[in-house]
């Protein structure tokens, strides 16, 4: 039960997380106009990975998309492509933990390819969450060296007459968002890697040996496992363990409304 | 056809206070900003306050600040300026405009008269 | 504040003939994101509200007759009539769109020579 807590909490967590990626690699408040110190302007700009925008005061926002491939900063194209290998990764991971899922059935899939997938959708998680949290810090850091650097500027080449405002960008939504965003795919990455060791089979496996009594039936496991005694007319023995193994009566598996084929 | 109609405008006392109304129509005025120019006889303009569309943000000249209230009914397509501590130089024509493109005043009232006079 | 300085003061010109006015302002109205120019040209006659002619320093107004031009990027502007009309003679005010507060020029009154 707890494991499959740990499995469901995971996913529902790297889902939010992943949505985050998506949402703060769209958004165009990567860095906006720093007011602070600033003479107040009827005209904000702010800036995405894909597009730069002005908004107005009276309300007009316009905004051009960076149409050139090779005339961006190097850094900004980094950051773009951590976020994409983020979104793939996480997507991929996505997909690769609903089959992975305890609670859904998919014919007679075993529970050590369970915990394999859980594992391989874990460490997806990890990895996308560590690309979001790398392309955001990569783009906070480009954004803090040139503010110190325009804010040098400003206090420098004064002496004219006609001042020039040198216009500073701070952090905007979009980066908050993806740090929170790369940190809940981290964490259910890890919840992920938690939950698969749980699923994972013992070392040694027993076949369990049914023997069939009339009036109720008792199934056995060598090596001191725990015994499961079923009475009434039902003949059909209890899993008690299933480690790969399964007794004859077993193999079917009976449809549940949990179940996805 | 858009329309801008001021009203409110009179005589009034140094220290009186005075509210002006602009009456907006034929454009969508919740998602418009407003603003209050006005301009003293035989004078140049005087950009006096903005309001923002969503009544967000409020901007002031300094020679009106913390006299003087811009504030807006979207309810009721008007715009309001409310004039406290008035003074001699406050004596304008004063007239409602809207923000359009490039913060630009696109549409003017025809402006209400305010005499401040003892 | 931002300063803007209008010039001339006053403009005498004969009908048909070409008009300049110029407008400086003390920090630069070009906003980067965009590359545009936030500064506005109105037109004012006797007894009128002011009317809108130019804005982001060379966009006309829809309705505006096109012997009106507007020009100039950062701090320095000019406003060109190009063949003036008898309805042109006016004051003509420059006003800065970038920063608040919305400064305006003084103003530059065309008059008939």
């Known amino acids: 039960m707890a494991v499959t807590a740990c499995q469901g909490l995971g996913f529902v967590v790297s889902l939010i997380g992943i949505a985050g990626i998506i949402a703060a690699t769209c958004m165009d408040q990567w860095s906006t106009q720093d007011l602070y110190n600033n003479p107040v302007t009827a005209v904000f700009n702010y800036q995405g990975l894909w597009r730069s925008c002005v908004r107005e005061s009276s309300g007009f926002t316009e905004c051009r998309g960076y149409f050139t491939l090779l005339g961006l900063p190097a850094m900004l194209q980094a950051v773009r492509a951590l976020m994409i290998v983020g979104i793939v990764l996480g997507a991929i991971g996505l997909l690769v933990s609903i089959f992975a899922l305890k609670c859904i059935r998919i014919g007679s899939m075993e529970d050590s390819a369970k915990a394999n997938m859980t594992l391989t959708s874990g460490i997806m998680f990890i990895v996308s969450g560590l690309c979001a949290i790398a392309g955001v810090s990569v783009f906070a850091n480009m954004l803090v060296t040139n503010f110190w650097m325009s804010t040098a500027n400003m206090y420098t080449g004064m002496g004219g007459m006609v001042q020039t405002v040198q216009t500073r960008y701070t952090f905007g939504a979009a980066l908050f968002v993806g740090w929170v965003a790369g940190g809940l795919t981290l964490i259910g990455g890890v919840m992920m890697c938690i939950a698969c060791r749980g699923l994972a089979p013992e070392e040694t496996n027993y076949k369990a040996v049914s023997y069939h009594a009339s009036g109720h039936s008792v199934a056995y496991k060598p090596g001191g496992f725990k015994a499961s005694t079923g009475f009434g007319s039902n003949t059909k023995n209890k899993k008690i363990y299933d480690g790969g193994a399964r007794t004859e009566d077993e193999v079917q598996s009976y449809p549940s409304k949990h179940d996805y084929v | 056809e858009v329309q801008l109609v001021e009203s409110g405008g009179g005589l009034v006392k140094p220290g009186g206070s005075l509210r002006l109304s602009c009456a907006a129509s034929?454009?969508?005025?919740?998602?418009?900003?407003m603003s209050w120019v006005r301009q003293a006889p035989g004078k140049g303009l005087e950009w006096v306050s903005t309001?923002?569309?969503?009544?967000?943000?409020?901007y002031y000249a300094d020679s009106v600040k913390g006299r003087f209230t811009i504030s807006r009914d979207n309810a009721k397509n008007s715009l309001y300026l409310q004039m406290n501590s008035l003074r001699a130089e406050d004596t304008a024509v004063y007239y409602c405009?809207?923000?359009?493109?490039?913060?630009?005043?696109?549409?003017w009232g025809q402006g209400t008269l305010v005499t401040v006079s003892s | 504040d931002i300063v803007m300085t209008q010039s001339p003061d006053s403009l005498a010109v004969s009908l048909g003939e070409r008009a300049t006015i110029n407008c400086k302002s003390s920090?630069?109205?070009?906003?980067?994101?965009?590359?545009?120019?936030?500064l506005t040209w109105y037109q004012q006659k006797p007894g009128q509200p002011p009317k809108l002619l130019i804005y982001?320093?060379?966009t006309r107004e829809s309705g505006v007759p096109d012997r009106f031009s507007g020009s100039g990027s950062g701090t320095d502007f000019t406003l060109t009539i190009s063949s003036l009309q008898a309805e042109d003679f006016a004051v003509y005010y420059c006003?800065?769109?970038?920063?608040?507060?919305?400064?305006f020029g003084g103003g530059t009154k065309v008059e008939i020579k």
């Open positions: 405009a809207r923000q359009g493109y490039g913060n630009a005043l696109d549409y």
């Open positions: 982001w320093s060379s």
């Open positions: 034929g454009f969508s005025f919740s998602n418009s900003a």
């Open positions: 006003q800065n769109d970038y920063y608040y507060p919305l400064t």
């Open positions: 920090q630069s109205l070009l906003q980067s994101g965009n590359n545009k120019n936030y």
């Open positions: 309001i923002s569309s969503g009544d967000s943000y409020t």
